[in-house]
């Protein structure tokens, strides 16, 4: 009976859900050969991007975990995470506590002139407390990071501060002034909510704004510092004290990085020496004449930082500010985030090892992990095969490239380290879930800081993840030569062991291949591959640039094609590698399935799944993005893949079946 020879429909609930998802997001009345983006994403244009939707699903899963009444072991990490989440959700208690807990914090810091007791304590004492106890850095940032010469050696880095105001160095004066005006209103609100009188609040807020403005003017752009060789300057604490004497560097850093033992001869990495000199001068000037304004500036900054843990009046003030600033910088309004999502994120930040274990146990069991590893192996093998056939690589470069792939570590789902049972069951003994939500947050901030310092101090054979297991961003770490695929990414609709393989290869597989190609991004930079056939490489380069430039863009979409080249190359190559791996899989294994009632062959489903990953609404930020706008991320790679035109029977010369193509990878 020949009818049974074709791929059979997959009718499990996961497949039916996926089919419904595809039907809901696609617009099949559009011709796939001219606008595959609309064919796959037409109805989803107004929705979040597919990654955001998945991130929300993952957070919902964490929410369910945290909301199920479980009989956790008393005092365990799980119990503390659960208690923290619930106290975050208890808005009645937060409202009832009002500003009391915050005012207590302000008093501990020596008070301020706006309200409450003012004890005019030592400037460096306040700064030391802010840095070490509250994780707040008003004048500069200090953090542990890799030593520029030895990425596995941690070293204290002193960097420019992060301003709460979204200032850019190329901002026109009018916008700059408007931003500060809105921010002044916000600071006035904070001071008033904390009991201050308008006259005092305005006086202190205005001075705080002027301090911020002056500090901002001291910053030097990254490119300028890089060009002058001043982006990584090794200095000792003693030398720093000489350059910027207003700060008691040793005591502030010692308190912040306990239990590290620091001495005046300790070396640090400084990222903007000139800024620190000017900042110190400003502080000294203010300590002479306006000590209390300096204190208010520091306290206001802390209040801004802590406002998410405060009552609804503070949240509302913050929301209004964000809305105004987005209008000024011509960004679309931010959709309101529900309380549960904020609480899940906070809990995830402070109790990551515990939540990682709970999430992975539920969302990325052994069978899913094993299927994901098999998929990765297939993709990696296809890449190795492909490297042998690149016209611009000579044999020596090919061997080097293959070795690089062979030595690559992969971390799938969650880091081995994070899933160690003793870590997952961590008891967080130093966390006191206090009488108020703010106190609980502060206790968690201190605990997290201590854990970060400890983790840097321990010899760490494994890669330290930059994302949480429930995140949706894969990445390649150059320094550790490891590629990371968090469990949160390898979820429906991108991946499921029960999906047709076309879906897994087209969606998750192309993401994996894309990340693998980032191993070689250095080769694509000018002069990055001396042993390559640079003429052929240059030709492929130009060809790809021209290919992308030829695509029409939807109205009001802009992007910078010099920023996006490397990502475009990884998109095109990633799709080709995933397709090669999938084709090989089809040849070797029969029994492929399809999604019912979509009327798409396995190969068509492969491309449909690839496009699904890219579904999202273009946004104004695309002009600063290293990725192309979503239309291009679909059409660029599909039009570069002859198989696409073959399987969708596209007429020669159609937009997605051009007469000539480029091959970089």
């Amino acid at each position: 009976n020949f009818q049974n020879c074709g791929p059979r429909p997959c009718e499990t609930s996961v497949c039916l859900d996926l089919r419904d998802h595809y039907l809901a997001s696609g617009n099949t009345s559009v011709a796939p050969c001219t606008d595959f983006f609309s064919f796959a994403c037409g109805r989803a244009k107004e929705t979040n991007n597919s990654f955001q939707e998945l991130a929300t699903k993952n957070k919902n899963r964490l929410r369910r975990i945290l909301e199920v009444q479980n009989s956790w072991h008393p005092g365990s990490g799980e119990e503390k995470a659960f208690q923290f989440y619930n106290s975050c959700m208890d808005t009645l208690a937060i409202e009832a506590a009002g500003t009391g807990p915050l005012r207590q914090v302000i008093e501990e810091l020596g008070g301020w002139r706006i309200s409450g007791k003012w004890t005019s304590l030592n400037f460096n004492r306040t700064l030391r407390l802010l840095m070490s106890q509250y994780g707040h850095f008003p004048f500069f940032r200090a953090y542990l990071g890799p030593h520029p010469a030895s990425p596995h050696t941690p070293v204290i880095q002193i960097d420019q501060p992060e301003f709460d105001v979204p200032l850019k160095q190329d901002q026109e004066q009018k916008i700059y002034a408007q931003i500060f005006r809105e921010y002044l209103t916000y600071l006035n609100q904070l001071g008033t909510l904390l009991g201050g009188d308008p006259s005092k609040v305005q006086e202190h807020s205005s001075l705080s704004i002027s301090i911020t403005s002056r500090l901002f003017q001291f910053l030097r752009p990254l490119e300028q510092r890089r060009a002058q060789g001043k982006l990584f300057q090794m200095v000792t604490i003693d030398q720093l004290k000489e350059m910027a004497p207003a700060i008691d560097w040793l005591s502030c850093l010692q308190a912040t990085f306990t239990p590290m033992s620091l001495s005046p001869s300790q070396s640090l990495v400084v990222h903007d020496v000139e800024y620190l000199k000017n900042m110190s001068q400003l502080v000294e000037e203010m300590l002479l004449k306006q000590r209390d304004f300096l204190q208010s500036h520091m306290i206001l900054g802390l209040v801004v930082t802590l406002s998410p843990a405060l009552d609804s009046q503070f949240q509302e003030a913050r929301r209004k500010l964000s809305q105004k600033l987005r209008e000024l910088t011509e960004q679309p309004p931010m959709p309101a985030r529900p309380r549960w999502m904020k609480c899940v994120e906070e809990t995830g930040t402070f109790f990551e090892p515990t939540l990682a274990a709970l999430f992975v146990r539920e969302a990325f069991g052994p069978s899913t992990r094993s299927a994901a590893m098999k998929l990765f192996t297939a993709i990696r093998d296809a890449l190795i095969t492909r490297l042998r056939n690149l016209p611009w690589m000579n044999e020596e470069t090919q061997n080097m490239a293959q070795d690089k792939v062979a030595q690559l570590q992969v971390e799938m789902g969650a880091s081995e380290w994070a899933l160690k049972p003793e870590l997952a069951r961590q008891e967080y003994n130093d966390i006191q879930l206090g009488s108020s939500f703010l106190q609980s947050v502060l206790s968690c901030v201190r605990s997290l800081r201590a854990r970060i310092v400890q983790s840097f101090l321990q010899p760490h054979p494994q890669h330290r993840w930059k994302v949480s297991p429930w995140d949706v961003n894969a990445y390649y770490s150059v320094s550790d030569h490891v590629v990371v695929f968090p469990a949160g990414l390898l979820q429906p609709p991108f991946f499921h062991p029960g999906y047709p393989r076309a879906v897994n290869f087209g969606a998750a597989g192309s993401i994996m291949a894309h990340e693998l190609l980032h191993i070689f991004y250095q080769l694509l930079l000018p002069g990055g591959c001396l042993a390559c056939d640079n003429h052929a490489l240059q030709e492929a380069h130009l060809c790809l640039k021209r290919h992308y430039a030829a695509f029409p863009l939807p109205s009001r979409t802009s992007f910078n094609d010099s920023l996006t080249f490397l990502e475009n190359a990884a998109d095109v190559g990633g799709l080709a590698i995933a397709l090669q791996a999938y084709s090989k899989r089809l040849l070797r294994h029969h029994g492929e399935t399809v999604l019912p009632s979509l009327d798409l062959s396995p190969q068509q489903i492969f491309f449909r799944s690839y496009a699904q990953v890219m579904c999202r609404k273009p946004s104004p930020q695309d002009s600063h993005d290293t990725h192309s706008p979503p239309h291009l991320r679909v059409h660029g790679p599909l039009s570069s893949t002859p198989a696409f035109a073959r399987y969708f029977r596209c007429a020669r010369g159609a937009l997605l079946n051009p007469s000539s193509r480029c091959q970089l990878w």
Partner: antibody, heavy 116, light 111 residues
Framework: QVQLKESGPGLLAPSQSLSITCTVS????????VYWVRQPPGKGLEWLGI???????NYQSVLRSRLSITKDDSKSQVFLKLNSLQTDDTATYYC??????????WGQGTLVTVSA | DIVLTQSPASLAVSLGQRAIISCKAS??????????MHWYQQRPGQQPKLLIY???NLEAGVPTRFSGSGSRTDFTLNIHPVEEDDAATYYC?????????FGGGTRLEIK
């Protein structure tokens, strides 16, 4: 607890100067503002001026030329001085602490009569 | 200066009934969203006593029979149910800008 007590001269003649001391306890004058309010017999309340924790002052506009408010933080005392008295300066003079959120703590008041 | 006009100048209310006192400002007393209007009670021969601060916040120890509402230029003090003890003069006061000012007062008499 917070307490404020005014002490004044009672009776003064026109053109003389009025000096009242407000002695406080239960809080520090470096942290909080203290203001003065007066109330003529059988009439309403009139705000006179304030001295803040940092020593800065704000005054009622019509009295600015005749009025000064000073303090001695170490003695926890605030002083009101009103020059060139007229009979319509007759009133009960109150000092009050400006607490956070404008929560106020008042003294008992001291009656000052200006009479020829 | 911000002028505060209280009405009525006096009112007589039966025990257990509701007393409503209004205070209108000549310009807004709102600063960045917070209305800086306060209410005082003054019994004969005593200093004024704060009842409500910043429009609607009850001072510690003040019975919940007292409540305040309003925004920008129009404010109200509500007393319900009125008790014998509430016979006094009531003043509104603004601290939005200098000079701080008081309303002319409302005398409440219990019938």
């Amino acid at each position: 607890q917070v307490q404020l007590k005014e002490s004044g001269p009672g009776l003064l003649a026109p053109s003389q100067s009025l000096s009242i001391t407000c002695t406080v306890s239960g809080f520090s004058l470096t942290s909080y503002g203290v203001y003065w309010v007066r109330q003529p017999p059988g009439k309403g309340l009139e705000w006179l001026g304030i001295i803040w924790g940092d020593g800065s002052t704000n005054y009622q506009s019509v009295l600015r030329s005749r009025l000064s408010i000073t303090k001695d933080d170490s003695k926890s005392q605030v002083f009101l001085k009103l020059n060139s008295l007229q009979t319509d300066d007759t009133a009960t003079y109150y000092c009050a602490k400006r607490g956070d959120y404008d929560v106020a703590y008042w003294g008992q008041g001291t009656l000052v009569t200006v009479s020829a | 200066d911000i002028v505060l006009t209280q009405s009525p100048a006096s009112l007589a209310v039966s025990l257990g009934q509701r007393a409503i006192i209004s205070c209108k400002a000549s310009q807004t007393v709102s600063f960045v969203g917070t209305s800086l209007m306060h209410w005082y009670q003054q019994r004969p021969g005593q200093q004024p006593k704060l009842l409500i601060y910043r429009t609607s916040n009850l001072e510690a120890g003040v019975p919940t029979r007292f409540s305040g509402s309003g925004s920008r230029t129009d404010f109200t003090l509500n007393i319900h149910p009125v008790e014998e003890d509430d016979a006094a003069t009531y003043y509104c006061q603004q601290s939005r800008e200098f000079p701080w000012t008081f309303g002319g007062g409302t005398r409440l008499e219990i019938k």
